[in-house]
Interface confidence: medium
């Protein structure tokens, strides 16, 4: 049993069938020594009586919310989480596996720069009774501080039948370098509470691979006199790492037809323009990546031909 | 040149190469990238690898300032990384000729630190890899390792020879 | 396809050192481990070590230590081992082979070790 | 060290029989182990490296399988040729270590 805040503890149970559970022993906050009664949630059945309870913990149903009162008066609450390991592996059963870039995949994270900032996020189907707290470090022996904010809700999809339910948490590193070469990785720890079910999720990266600059801006089309070619130019995103001459980018330029089937015409440059022939009723795509180390592509920003 | 007196280095012909040595980085990884990395573990090998950290002087400010401090660590992880790859992880099978990425850039990392450092000329406190022999099971793993390591390294150098060739060239 | 041409036969007396030789072709020397096995007559094979040509770095099994040593020469592509202090225990065939995987061998030294 | 043990010592068969050699090792090995040929008066030659991958030039009646510390060497349909001695090697940890082997004879 381990402390996860003030007055919320986490029992560790093997799951199988006839587990013996663990003991537990619960103490009421009070300098108060006679009179003291247990009981468990909104129930009014004495559990117990004294300053301390001693409890086994075996299932769902011996989790939750443990009072001491004397007399009517509440004197302290402690609340009882269960975290399940079934074969020696924790349960992961509140979020879903994205199962991309890998399986047991729960939380994948992006930056847009190498500001030290970035997003992470995960997906659960489970609506109600549920909180998130997310912590982070670059490091674990000597831990350098990252600030992560609240974890909140970003989005809703339906699913076949099922509501998926999508959340968010940006982090800042403190201290970030942006031009040094990492060598610690950053880790993401979220706790996850739904009803009486805690669980852990871990993630552990370096910013330089969950780069995904955003898509170039101000993408332009100039036709060249008496030529079906197009002069194509855009700007790096505002969001990416400056200066441009140090952080530099390179670019994929797709001529694509209206119909999927056709053949695309690639060019790739690391320059912000270039000449390609504008097909009629194609569109021109750009996208971005960080020239010197081959992350993620940003998405396309697109202008058709016409 | 990046002579130890201070000169300027052909900022621009370390650019190209710099750049090739990014892509050949990638282009060796496919090599180990089936690795089951299930073995893992904190090999010494890849802990010791020289980092181009905050305090290095290779940020756009540090080069503007004095891009010795910087030019002589990458320097020293060129040296570094031409070694590891000649060593017993990267000999023999899977066959890792001349003509292979590997092998290319082997010979990109050597062309490179002696552009930076011609003959005749010393930069002090080379850290070189004292490598006891890996086991053969740790093998791949370690050429996985090494490798990513390598690229991160060669991206940082290639940004300070590109910001170089943008800002710093004659 | 690579080739492994091992030195001729030896006949040296009990306490004396030999340095057996081993020329290399149709690879690139320094890209590639040479290590050295013992087969004593009607007997199995035993890993002495290896040397990597490239930094001339070596790897002996513990039982050899102090009775092989491993060197190589880049410019003559040529792989050797010397072994001393010779008793009638190290009279034997001893064979160069090439790669992590033996997968080519030379035809053999055989040396006798007698007074 | 790690040790590999073959059996059996001897095996007569006879020309067209499949046969197979057996090697333990005496930990995991996961798939690192190999097979050699060596014939009377010649050097061994590999047939087989990570327990089942051929070697390019050996005849396809050989192959391997196994992993972890149970291998085993298969010949489909013995050849007259292919008498001699077959030795399996841990190819895992340093040092390298072989098998007693076995020798293949023709009844």
């Known amino acids: 049993i381990w402390e996860l805040k003030k007055d919320v503890y986490v029992v560790e149970l093997d799951w199988y069938p006839d587990a013996p559970g663990e003991m537990v022993v619960l103490t009421c906050d009070t300098p108060e020594e006679d009179g003291i009664t247990w009981t468990l949630d909104q129930s009014s059945e004495v559990l117990g009586s004294g300053k301390t309870l001693t409890i086994q913990v075996k299932e769902f149903g011996d989790a939750g919310q443990y009072t001491c009162h004397k007399g009517g008066e509440v004197l302290s609450h402690s609340l009882l989480l269960l975290h399940k390991k079934e074969d020696g592996i924790w349960s992961t059963d509140i979020l879903k596996d994205q199962k991309e870039p890998k399986n047991k995949t729960f939380l994948r994270c992006e930056a847009k720069n190498y500001s030290g900032r970035f997003t992470c996020w995960w997906l659960t189907t489970i609506s109600t009774d549920l909180t998130f707290s997310v912590k982070s470090s670059r490091g674990s022996s000597d831990p350098q501080g990252v600030t992560c904010g609240a974890a909140t809700l970003s989005a809703e999809r339906v699913r076949g039948d099922n509501k998926e339910y999508e959340y968010s948490v940006e982090c800042q590193e403190d201290s970030a370098c942006p031009a040094a070469e990492e060598s610690l990785p950053i880790e993401v720890m979220v706790d996850a509470v739904h009803k009486l079910k805690y669980e852990n999720y871990t993630s552990s990266f370096f910013i330089r691979d969950i780069i995904k600059p955003d898509p170039p801006k101000n993408l332009q089309l100039k036709p060249l006199k008496n030529s079906r070619q197009v002069e194509v130019s855009w700007e790096y995103p505002d969001t990416w790492s400056t200066p441009h001459s140090y952080f530099s980018l390179t670019f994929c330029v797709q001529v694509q037809g209206k119909s999927k089937r056709e053949k695309k015409d690639r060019v790739f440059t690391d320059k912000t323009s270039a000449t390609v022939i504008c097909r009629k009723n194609a569109s021109i795509s750009v996208r971005a990546q960080d020239r010197y180390y081959s992350s993620s592509w940003s998405e396309w920003a697109s202008v058709p031909c016409s | 040149r990046a002579v130890p007196g201070g000169s300027s280095p052909a900022w621009t012909q370390c650019q190209q190469l710099s750049q090739k040595l990014c892509t050949l980085a990638w282009s060796a990884h496919p090599l180990v990238g089936h690795m089951d990395l299930r073995e893992e573990g904190d090999e010494e090998t890849t802990n010791d690898v020289p980092h181009i950290q905050c305090g290095d002087g290779c940020d756009p400010q540090g080069l503007r300032d004095n891009s010795q401090f910087c030019l002589q660590r990458i320097h020293q992880g060129l040296i570094f990384y031409e070694k590891l790859l000649g060593s017993d992880i990267f000999t023999g099978e899977p066959s890792l000729l001349p003509d292979s990425p590997v092998g290319q850039l082997h010979a990109s990392l050597l062309g490179l630190s002696q552009l930076l450092q011609p003959e005749g000329h010393h930069w002090e406190t080379q850290q070189i890899p004292s490598l006891s022999p890996s086991q053969p099971w740790q093998r791949l793993l370690l050429r996985f390792k090494i490798l990513r390591s390598l690229q991160a390294f060669v991206a940082v150098a290639a940004r300070v020879f590109a910001h170089g060739a943008a800002t710093l060239s004659p | 396809e690579v080739q492994l041409q091992q030195s001729g036969p030896e006949l040296v007396k009990p306490g004396a050192s030999v340095k057996m030789s081993c020329k290399a072709s149709?690879?690139?020397?320094?890209?590639?481990?040479m290590n050295w096995v013992k087969q004593k007559p009607g007997q199995g094979l035993e890993w002495i070590g290896y040397?990597?040509?490239?930094?001339?770095?070596?790897n002996y099994n513990e039982k050899f230590k102090g009775k092989a040593t491993l060197t190589s020469d880049k410019s003559s592509t040529t792989a050797y081992m010397e072994l001393s202090s010779l008793t009638s225990e190290d009279s034997a065939v001893y064979y160069c082979?090439?790669?992590?995987?033996?997968?080519?061998w030379g035809q053999g030294t055989t040396l006798t070790v007698s007074s | 060290d790690i040790v590999m043990t073959q059996s059996p010592a001897t095996l007569s068969v006879t020309p067209g029989d499949r046969v197979s050699l057996s090697c333990r090792a005496s930990?995991?090995?996961?798939?690192?182990l190999y097979w050699y040929q060596q014939k009377s008066h010649e050097s061994p030659r590999l047939l087989i490296k990570?327990?089942?991958q051929s070697i390019s030039g050996i005849p396809s009646r050989f192959s391997g399988s196994g992993s972890g510390s149970d291998f085993t060497l298969s010949i489909n349909s013995v050849e007259p040729e292919d008498v001699g001695m077959y030795y399996c090697?841990?190819?895992?940890?340093?040092?390298?270590?072989f098998g007693g082997g076995t020798k293949l004879e023709i009844k």
């Open positions: 149709g690879n690139t020397f320094t890209r590639y481990v």
């Open positions: 090697q841990n190819g895992h940890s340093f040092p390298y270590t």
């Open positions: 930990q995991s090995i996961s798939h690192y």
């Open positions: 082979v090439h790669n992590w995987d033996l997968d080519y």
């Open positions: 990570y327990a089942s």
């Open positions: 040397i990597n040509p490239y930094n001339d770095g070596t």
